[in-house]
Structures are given as structure tokens and as C-alpha cells.
Amino acid sequence: MNGRVDYLVTEEEINLTRGPSGLGFNIVGGTDQQYVSNDSGIYVSRIKENGAAALDGRLQEGDKILSVNGQDLKNLLHQDAVDLFRNAGYAVSLRVQHRLQVQNGPIGHRGEGDPSG
């Protein structure tokens, strides 16, 4: 019998300084691009090598970004979210939700709709 897979959800404030090539990550999600079932949130899909986010080290693929400089990312179209990041200025504060997989029992599996999959 499979063990149950639970998730430990934590939030973190990450302050990034925009580098020469920007913030250094990609996003998916939005009300018109649901990446996770029944969730129109914005998720990190790629951390660029040697970019600002990678050098900081805290932002991870699969993280959900809740806000940028205090502005909520709920109910945004995908391109509007992209534009929000692009216009966020030099110092960028991200409120991020990390979701860590915690396995209970002998066999775990990644759930359908897991953003890190």
C-alpha cells in the first residue's frame, strides 16, 4: 500500500536586487494559464543559471509567488503578471510560498498538479 504524501507549506520574504540581466527566473500561471488544477496562482518554472535569483539561492522552481513589492498576484492574467515583474524596479520584494514534500509511509508519489513536476 502506498504511503500518503503530505506537503509542508512555508512562506518567506525574498528581497532580490535586479542584476544586469534582470531577476533571472521564469513563471507560469495566471487566470488564463492555470498551471496547477483549480489554482490561477503564479509559479516559478525556471531559475536561470547565474541570474539574480540563482545567486541569492532562496527562490526555487515550483515556488508560488504570492506578491511582488506588496502587490498581490491573485487573479492576474499571465502577461499582466509578467509585466508586473518587469516593471517592479531595482529592488524587488517577493512573498513566496515553498511547498516541501513530506512522505508518510514507505512509498511516495508526486501528486497530479504538483508544480515542481
Epitope: G22, Q33, F85
Partner: nanobody
Framework: HVQLVESGGGLVQAGGSLRLSCTAS????????MAWFRQAPGKEREFVAA??????YYADSVKGRFTISRDNAKNTMYLQMNSLKPEDTAVYIC?????????????????????WGQGTQVTVSS
Amino acid sequence: HVQLVESGGGLVQAGGSLRLSCTASGRTFSTYTMAWFRQAPGKEREFVAAITWSGTYYADSVKGRFTISRDNAKNTMYLQMNSLKPEDTAVYICAAVIGSTVDSYSPSDPLEYDYWGQGTQVTVSS
């Protein structure tokens, strides 16, 4: 991991047409930013066209002749190539990355993409 497989290449006469396809694995194809590059023997890899969530981009050399498109239901991107010229002869390679960059997008920069296909040969004879 995303796998990309190109098809549709071949030999065509100048002035003719071809349609290339790039089929991708993965359940979130609609979120991919995708591009076509080409490489002729002894030359650098050259950007051809790209398609993002918000629009399309073309190299000046193919503008008005080539059209990039996608069918999310089929996990496939296309390159319709019309009015082909001998100088279009090359291996055509598709590239992809998951999501949209939050930085300024440079479609012709290979570092924008994480995944690459093996390519399909296009030969245009005069």
C-alpha cells in the same frame, strides 16, 4: 524533462513550401515558450522564429515568408515556410523553455531555452 521531436523536413525547389512540426512531451505544453533555430554547414546557429504566450517573433531574413504557430491540444509547434530560397537550406532545430521570463525576452538568445530537439534537414535546390 521535456523532449522535442522535429519532423517535416525534406528537399524542395526554390519558391516551394514546407511545414515543419515540433512535438513536445509534457502536460503543460501551453505554457512553453518555443522557438525555431537553424544551422547551415560551417555556420553559426541562427534564430528563425519564436512563439510566446503573448506573441510571435521573426528573424528579418524570414519575415513575411515563414509563419510560426502552435496547437496546444496536439502538443505541437509548426513552422510554415513559403517562398523558400537556397539560403534557407539548413538543419532546423526547435527549442523550448517552460514559462515566460520575467526579464526582457531575447528570442534569438539560445540561453533563453532549456530544451533542444535533434533537428530536421531542409534542403532548397535552385
